[in-house]
Interface confidence: low
């Protein structure tokens, strides 16, 4: 459990892959902190408790309630708010101390699930990574998020300040492109319930300590039960789901959200002056201006909201979680003031929820979303966000109920459909998930054009034998989610040579291949000895990648880390491999034995990243009946020979022999990655 430098932790993506051939690896889900352009950083996930987390989808637009809310309704909102506010100081958000004097930050071990402070969200952004890694993941632009508010505020300025001397310009603040916390989508395919994940958790790089999810551990468990993980980007709740749509935008504009109460209208000039500073990027000055307004007018909701926004901007500018926690608290304060206009209340709480998610305070965010839904029960978009909030903490059952409720009221809500389909697929209700995923994507609603949904729709269709799967993969490719129809990994570095099968010479790793082929019997014998004496070390594939059969693996290295316990079972093999850093240092891969028994079929699936190539050394290969297809070419293994393929391309495996098949899997860095990229890419 060494404490982990968040930096290290961030950016570790979980894997969702397991290649059909004997491996089914899934590195625990890691929350990823994704940078927009190169989502390379991801937050850490705790181990023990961890539950793969994926992220929220896009968030909803801020739809303001009717502008003139009657006083009565206002009072109701106020009283409900007050009840809730005080009842709830949300859990984890202000973990002031979490970073502070709590002793050693708990690193959550994959296993331990201790709480730990995974909050270094800003600081961990690994700015040095220069390569472009596009993780086709959930990318929601965070930018929308604050700017959702922005839109509304601007309207405010337009509408309530017609004579404002300057035209209100869309905020040009830098948004956390990088801050979208893109969490990985863990697809444990059909295993999501508080089940025991049968997986191989090879603890790895970034999970927090013992029992807590997300906080500071360095270990990440490779959970073998997670099938494709697509990285999800944490979408800021407020990230305007519907506002991408011009029509919606217009509608929202028409609504002219009301951000000023009667009192605030009387101090409008002062508010505008402070807001102007913020909009011009003079953040420190704006903070001071709003602080002064809050001091002078402690009951002013708009002044308090302005202060929160300035703190939010400042957090982004300084990349400071501590400042962001202050903003989260201030957004909360807005909601606890008397006579808060409904639109402002909604904006403030939505942004609060979003920033809580960004910091990894999923439970706190959920409480905020629950509160929003109570306050604005007719706002479907908030219910959709609430569903995402539940998904983010692993509560599929409640998420499912939320989406069922949304669909009962608005049956054509595309966002609810894709998420409901997603949940059904997670429950292994493959056929039932298809119409929801399909119609949801077809709806074109904001938040539905996400690689994960194409990924799962295609996968579901393949599993029920529907040839239309490739139509959806093609569409996903056209829309920029996949590198090609065949190559559907989500964590990719652009520009790397892409071909399904490789020769040793093409990889440049000829010495490694020679060494594997020269020593294949030694490698085989150690694997067989483990099978014989410690069969329990071979852990079953549990990513729901198999249509049928029996398939297990025994992992020696994962995420660039040697598993000392495992190497005790195969000491010579481990010693042999130590000479080859292209594999032992491949933090986006594994080294493992893979045993597959007769009668096994592994569904077509795709690995998580194009940053590795996968070598298969045949150890015990039945005469016939075993084959692997990668893209559109099918091959068979031979004892003592290495096959090399790029598992970011779709691959499928069949074992129809009469005895077991044992191979040794060795992942290597893609040969075109530079040394700097190899050092800086987050682990998978």
């Amino acid at each position: 459990f060494d404490l982990v430098d968040y930096e290290e932790v961030l950016g570790k993506l979980g894997i969702y892959d397991a290649d059909g051939d004997g491996d089914f690896d899934v590195d625990d889900a890691k929350v990823l902190l994704g940078l927009k352009e190169r989502s390379t950083s991801e937050p850490a996930v705790p181990p023990e408790e961890a539950e793969p987390h994926t992220e929220p989808e896009e968030q909803v637009p801020v739809e303001a309630e009717p502008q003139n809310i009657e006083d009565e309704a206002k009072e109701q909102i106020q009283s409900l708010l007050h009840e809730m506010v005080h009842a709830e100081h949300v859990e984890g958000e202000d973990l002031q101390q979490e970073d502070g004097p709590t002793g050693e930050p708990q690193q959550e071990d994959d296993e331990f699930l201790m709480a730990t402070d995974v909050d270094d969200r800003f600081e961990t952004l690994e700015p040095e990574v220069s390569h472009e890694e596009t993780e086709h993941s959930y990318h929601v632009e965070e930018t929308v998020s604050q700017d959702c508010n922005q839109d509304m505020e601007e309207m405010m300025s337009e509408q309530e300040n017609p004579d404002s001397s300057e035209p209100v310009v869309e905020d040009e603040r830098l948004h956390h492109d990088t801050d979208d916390v893109t969490y990985q989508v863990y697809e444990e395919q059909a295993v999501y319930e508080p089940l025991e994940n049968e997986g191989i958790e090879i603890t790895e790089v970034t999970a927090p300590p013992e029992d807590n999810p997300v906080e500071d551990s360095q270990v990440i468990v490779e959970e073998v039960s997670i099938f494709p993980v697509e990285e999800q980007q944490e979408v800021p709740p407020e990230t305007n789901r519907k506002t991408d749509d011009p029509e919606q935008k217009a509608k929202v504009k028409k609504k002219k959200p009301k951000l000023l109460n009667k009192f605030d209208k009387t101090i409008k000039a002062e508010l505008d002056a402070a807001e102007k500073l913020r909009k011009r990027g003079k953040i420190e000055e704006a903070v001071n201006a709003f602080k002064e307004l809050v001091r002078k007018y402690p009951q002013s909701p708009r002044a308090r909201y302005g202060k929160a926004q300035c703190e939010d901007d400042l957090a982004e500018k300084r990349r400071s979680n501590e400042v962001l926690r202050g903003a989260i608290e201030t957004y909360q304060e807005v909601a606890s003031l008397p006579d808060v206009p409904a639109d402002l209340l909604k904006l403030s709480l939505k942004r609060r929820s979003d920033r809580q998610q960004f910091l990894g305070h999923m439970r706190g965010s959920l409480l905020t979303l629950q509160r929003l839904v109570q306050l604005f029960p007719n706002d479907t978009s908030l219910k959709n966000d609430l569903g995402v909030g539940y998904l983010l903490i692993g509560d599929n059952d409640n998420a499912k109920k939320v989406y069922e409720e949304v669909l009962s009221v608005t049956p054509n809500d595309g966002f609810a459909k894709v998420h409901y389909g997603f949940i059904l697929k997670a429950q292994n209700k493959i056929a039932e998930s298809i119409p929801y995923l399909k119609e949801g994507i077809e709806s074109g609603d904001p938040g539905t054009d996400d690689g994960r949904f194409y990924f799962h729709l295609g996968d579901a269709m393949q599993r029920v034998g529907n040839k239309e799967a490739y139509k959806w993969y093609e569409l996903g490719h056209k829309r920029g989610h996949f590198a090609s129809v065949w190559q559907r990994s989500l964590y990719n570095v652009n520009g790397l040579k892409a071909q399904p099968w490789w020769t040793p010479k093409e990889t440049g790793y000829t010495e490694l291949v020679k060494s594997l082929e020269r020593n294949w019997k030694l490698i085989r014998d150690e694997g067989l000895a483990v099978m014989d004496k410690a069969k329990g070390l071979f852990l079953p594939e549990d990513e729901n990648l198999r249509e049928k059969g029996d398939w297990s693996q025994f992992t020696l290295w994962q995420q660039g880390r040697r598993n000392e316990n495992a190497c005790k079972g195969a000491p010579k093999t481990c010693t042999l491999l130590e000479k080859f850093p292209e594999t032992t240092g491949c933090r986006r891969g594994q080294i493992k034995y893979s045993i597959m028994h007769p009668g096994t079929h592994v569904w077509p699936h795709t690995g998580p990243t194009n940053c590795r190539l996968r070598m298969h050394l045949g150890l015990v290969i039945p005469k016939e009946g075993c084959k692997i297809r990668c893209a559109n070419e099918t091959k068979t293994w031979e004892e003592g020979k290495v096959l090399i393929f790029d598992d970011s391309f779709e691959h499928e495996v069949w074992q129809d022999a009469s005895s077991f098949r044992l191979i040794f899997i060795v992942d290597v860095w893609h040969p075109e990655l530079t040394p700097q990229q190899r050092r800086s890419l987050p682990a998978i």
């Epitope: 987390h53 699930l113 863990y186 039960s225 598993n563």
Partner: antibody, heavy 127, light 107 residues
């Protein structure tokens, strides 16, 4: 069904060692971190140690650090607590407990508390 | 390490009453706090984790709230089977620790 069964404890003299084991069944043992928790007669619960799902990491309470070792054998679905240099204050009922966890792609690994406990085994340290 | 305190040590209430327990921590543990119930001669069982999340099998009458350093779980209406000892436990920092317990007995 999901079950944890501790081995018989026993009476042991101060300074002597004792090894407890906990046999797991009904779930995928290798996917869960495991704890030992103890309870002195008439007292409250005291956390003792935890080991990660794969046995590679462990943590201990200050009162037992350096004397107790937690380990596991996933091939046998068994958790162990090796107790050396036992003291009278180590007397009590020892429970093994599983860390509950779940996963779904939308969420990180999540924690569900120590959700399954053994029935407990009594250790008495006395001369 | 973090020290947990629970009050009262004993709470005597009749069935059907509402029971409110309290757990304080010497440092901020955020929401990383669980509650366990233990009956005489039995192993503990988890009731709630991460403050307010009911574990599988925990009746809806049990609820949890609080964050940071002060936590107050409640049982809305005591049933005969609820008379037991209740422990809070933090997992925010090592070493993990339990509180001393609150005994809820029948008045």
């Amino acid at each position: 069904q999901v079950q944890l069964v501790e081995s018989e404890g026993g009476v042991v003299q101060p300074g002597r060692p004792l090894r407890l084991s906990c046999a797991a069944s009904g779930f995928t043992f290798s996917s869960h971190a495991m704890h030992w928790v103890r309870q002195a007669p008439g007292k409250g619960l005291e956390w003792v140690a935890v080991v990660s799902h794969d046995g590679s990491r462990d943590r201990y309470a200050g009162s037992v650090k350096g004397r107790f070792t937690i380990s596991r054998d996933n091939s046998k679905n068994t958790l162990y607590l090796q107790m050396n240099s036992l003291r009278p204050e180590d007397t009590g009922v020892y429970y093994c407990a599983r860390v509950g966890r779940s996963s779904n792609w939308f969420s990180r690994y999540y924690y569900y508390g120590m959700d399954v406990w053994g029935q407990g085994t009594t250790v008495t340290v006395s001369s | 390490g973090i020290v947990l305190t629970q009050s009262p040590a004993t709470l005597s209430l009749p069935p059907r009453e509402r029971a409110t327990l309290s757990c304080g921590t010497s440092q901020n543990v955020s929401h990383y706090l669980a509650w366990y119930q233990q009956k005489p001669g039995r192993a503990p069982r988890v009731l709630t984790y991460d403050v307010a999340n009911r574990a599988a099998g925990t009746p809806a009458r049990f609820s949890g709230s609080g964050s940071g350093t002060d936590f107050t779980p409640a049982i809305s209406s005591l049933e005969p089977e609820d008379f037991a000892v209740y422990y809070c436990q933090q997992r925010s920092n090592w070493p993990q620790a339990f509180g001393p317990g609150t005994k809820v007995d029948i008045k």
